[in-house]
C-alpha cells in the first residue's frame, strides 16, 4: 500500500476519504485505526455502526467521526479540532471476522493556522520542510507516496 498524505490546519476539521470497491467489501463494517510506527500495530480509533445497513450513520469517538457510503464505496473520517498530537500514520480498514483488510494508509500532517500568531513557531507552515522526498502532490490536502518510496517522517 502506498501512503496518502492528508494535511489539515490546527484547530480546524480534516476530512479523510478512503475509496474502496463496494462490491468486494459488500456487507463489511469499516474502521479507522492509528498505527504505532510504520511496522507497529494499528490501534482502533472508531468503527462504523454495528449494523452494516446503518453504516451511513456518523459515529463519533472523541473528536473523530466515521461514516460509510457503502453504495458509492467511500469511507469518510472526520478529525475535528485538529491538534499536533493527531499527526501520524493511520489506516482505513475493512473488517471481516477477526481480520482486517487495509483500504488505505494515511499520513495525517498538521499545519499551522495562519491566523493564529500565538503558537506560530509550534506548527508547520506549508512551504517549510517536507516530510516526504519527491512526493507527488495530488491536490491541496492530500498526496500519495511514489511507488517504492519510503515514507519519511519514526520517531519513534
Amino acid at each position: 500500500h502506498n501512503t496518502t498524505v492528508f494535511q489539515g490546519v490546527a484547530g480546524q476539521s480534516l476530512q479523510v476519504s478512503c475509496p474502496y470497491d463496494s462490491m468486494k467489501h459488500w456487507g463489511r463494517r469499516k474502521a479507522w485505526c492509528r498505527q504505532l510506527g510504520e511496522k507497529g500495530p494499528c490501534q482502533r480509533v472508531v468503527s462504523t455502526h454495528n449494523l452494516w445497513l446503518l453504516s451511513f450513520l456518523r459515529r463519533w469517538n472523541g473528536s473523530t467521526a466515521i461514516t460509510d457510503d457503502t453504495l458509492g464505496g467511500t469511507l469518510t473520517i472526520t478529525l475535528r479540532n485538529l491538534q499536533p498530537h493527531d499527526a501520524g500514520l493511520y489506516q482505513c480498514q475493512s473488517l471481516h471476522g477477526s481480520e482486517a483488510d487495509t483500504l488505505r494508509k494515511v499520513l495525517v500532517e498538521v499545519l499551522a493556522d495562519p491566523l493564529d500568531h500565538r503558537d506560530a513557531g509550534d506548527l508547520w507552515f506549508p512551504g517549510e520542510s517536507e516530510s516526504f522526498e519527491d512526493a507527488h502532490v495530488e491536490h491541496s490536502i492530500s498526496r500519495s507516496l511514489l511507488e517504492g518510496e519510503i515514507p519519511f517522517p519514526p520517531t519513534s
Epitope: 511496522k39 499536533p84 498530537h85 516530510s131 517522517p153 519514526p154
Partner: antibody, heavy 120, light 107 residues
Framework: QVQLVQSGAEVKKPGASVKVSCKAS????????IHWVRQAPGQGLEWMGW????????KYAPKFQGRATITADTSTSTAYMELSSLRSEDTAVYYC?????????????WGQGTLVTVSS | DIQMTQSPSSLSASVGDRVTITCHAS??????LSWYQQKPGKAPKLLIY???NLHTGVPSRFSGSGSGTDFTLTISSLQPEDFATYYC?????????FGQGTKVEIK
C-alpha cells in the same frame, strides 16, 4: 526474553574493515527496523543507518554512505553492520537498535554495544 | 540534515529538584521527537516518544511537551537514579539526528 545481543569487542588497524553482528531473540527482526548508532568515547550518539530486514531496504546517513553496509539474515534473525576504510576516529561503541520505524513506534530495543578500537 | 540543539549541555541538581531540558530543531519536525536516557557504559533507554508519550515502564515524573521546533523534557522530582545523560532525537526525516546531550549531575 526480548533482547538484542551483539558480537564482542574488536581491535582493528587503520584501513581495515569491521563487521559487527546483532542477534535478536524473543522477536522476529522482520517485524522491526534495525538501526545502527555509534558513540565515540565521551561523545554523543550518532545515527549511522537502518535496514528493513523484511524488504532488504537500507538507508544511511550521508556521512557513512559508501563506507557502511547494513545487512540482515532473517533466517538467523541477525543484523550486521560492516564499516570499511577504518580510521582512528571510528573508535566508538556501536549499538544496534530495533523499533517499528517512524510515526510513533512504541517498541524500542537496544543491543549492549560493541566497542571497536581502531589503532595502529 | 536537521540539527538538534539541546540546552543546557550539563546541569547540577539535587534530589527532589524539578529539572527541565530543552531541545530545538533546526526545522519543523511536527511531534516526531523522542527522549532517551543513557547511563555510563549502558545503551540508551527510551523515555518519551512522539514528543509527549511516556514509554512503557517509565516513571510518571518524566514528561515531554512541544511540537514544531521546540521541545521540553521535564523531571518533576529528580531521583538518585535519574542522574544520567539525556538525548533528544528527531524522527521527522532521515537521517535521524540526536541532540548533543544534557548531562544531569549531582549538586
Amino acid at each position: 526474553q526480548v533482547q538484542l545481543v551483539q558480537s564482542g569487542a574488536e581491535v582493528k588497524k587503520p584501513g581495515a574493515s569491521v563487521k559487527v553482528s546483532c542477534k535478536a531473540s524473543g522477536f522476529s527482526i522482520e517485524d522491526f527496523y534495525i538501526h545502527w548508532v555509534r558513540q565515540a568515547p565521551g561523545q554523543g550518539l550518532e545515527w549511522m543507518g537502518w535496514i528493513d530486514p523484511e524488504q532488504g531496504d537500507s538507508k544511511y546517513a550521508p556521512k557513512f554512505q559508501g563506507r557502511a553496509t547494513i545487512t540482515a539474515d532473517t533466517s538467523t534473525s541477525t543484523a550486521y553492520m560492516e564499516l570499511s576504510s577504518l580510521r582512528s576516529e571510528d573508535t566508538a561503541v556501536y549499538y544496534c537498535h530495533a523499533d517499528h520505524g517512524n510515526y510513533g513506534s512504541t517498541m524500542d530495543y537496544w543491543g549492549q554495544g560493541t566497542l571497536v578500537t581502531v589503532s595502529s | 540534515d536537521i540539527q538538534m540543539t539541546q540546552s543546557p549541555s550539563s546541569l547540577s541538581a539535587s534530589v527532589g529538584d524539578r529539572v527541565t531540558i530543552t531541545c530545538h530543531a533546526s526545522q519543523h519536525i511536527n511531534v516526531w521527537l523522542s527522549w532517551y536516557q543513557q547511563k555510563p557504559g549502558k545503551a540508551p533507554k527510551l523515555l518519551i516518544y512522539k514528543a509527549s508519550n511516556l514509554h512503557t515502564g517509565v516513571p510518571s515524573r518524566f514528561s515531554g511537551s512541544g511540537s514544531g521546533t521546540d521541545f521540553t523534557l521535564t523531571i518533576s522530582s529528580l531521583q538518585p537514579e535519574d542522574f544520567a545523560t539525556y538525548y533528544c532525537q528527531q524522527g521527522q526525516t532521515y537521517p535521524r539526528t540526536f541532540g548533543q546531550g544534557t548531562k544531569v549531575e549531582i549538586k
